[in-house]
Amino acid sequence: LQDPCSNCPAGTFCDNNRNQICSPCPPNSFSSAGGQRTCDICRQCKGVFRTRKECSSTSNAECDCTPGFHCLGAGCSMCEQDCKQGQELTKKGCKDCCFGTFNDQKRGICRPWTNCSLDGKSVLVNGTKERDVVCGPSPADLSPGASSVTPPAPAREPGHSPQ
């Protein structure tokens, strides 16, 4: 025997109180699949959340965050405060990155600068709170005879003082 509720489409629920008639979901509720025995209450995008997509009888509302905040979690379940580049969010608010660390985004934590020497490279551009260091060629690449980005300075002849 087929369940009479299986005929109820999305946007309705199977009303046991009314001989399993398919009743439409009331305002502020939805059913996204057929055969449902209840309508789910729509998500409310309040406070720091704002409505990205209105609730309909067949789909839930979707929220995002007001300017100055960004989404965290599945389906934007939380809003977290933005910080500036060069900062990270702590329990006491936005704090500048410590020396030796950087953050090039408005969210997330400060990360250590790349250690160029681990790859046998030299530092080409120093790091800042907002930017990682840029590693250059390895010192070996800069030795005489090796092709290099910047040619070595010409050697002075012995016995000649600079002019």
Epitope: F13, D15, N16, N17, P26, S29, R37, C39, D40, I41
Partner: nanobody, 126 residues
Framework: EVQLVETGGGLIQPGGSLRLSCAAS????????MSWVRQAPGKGLEWVSV???????YYADSVKGRFTISRDNSKNTLYLQMNSLRAEDTAVYYC????????????????????RGQGTTVTVSS
């Protein structure tokens, strides 16, 4: 005995206003989720508006900006103020007590109405 009695219907010209009342007995309106629903001739039930126990109100798109649901706790009465009435608002209007899952003011799911009045007829015609 739990009962709902609607009044205030009638014949009204397009663009006019009406206020429907729903007097409740046997339970407290303010601590329940209450709805107005309507049934146009030859059509199924259509939800019009809902008021939650915390006072939050919600409306069908077809009446948004024209109808207002409210309640008077001292009179244990639910109201529906209907403005800018249109021919398509012609229907029998019922108030109902709704059944929701969830605690307090934060329902999570709706599963039908358990009490409904006998209805009041609204006819919008010139």
């Amino acid at each position: 005995e739990v009962q709902l009695v609607e009044t205030g219907g009638g014949l009204i010209q397009p663009g006019g206003s009406l206020r429907l009342s729903c007097a409740a007995s046997g339970f407290t309106v303010s601590s329940n989720y209450m709805s107005w629903v309507r049934q146009a001739p030859g059509k199924g039930l259509e939800w019009v508006s809902v008021i939650y126990s915390d006072g939050s109100t919600y409306y069908a798109d077809s009446v948004k900006g024209r109808f207002t649901i409210s309640r008077d706790n001292s009179k244990n009465t639910l109201y529906l103020q209907m403005n800018s009435l249109r021919a398509e608002d012609t229907a029998v209007y019922y108030c109902a007590r709704d059944r929701y899952y969830g605690s307090g003011n934060y329902p999570t799911a709706y599963y039908g109405m358990d009490v409904r009045g006998q209805g009041t007829t609204v006819t919008v015609s010139s």
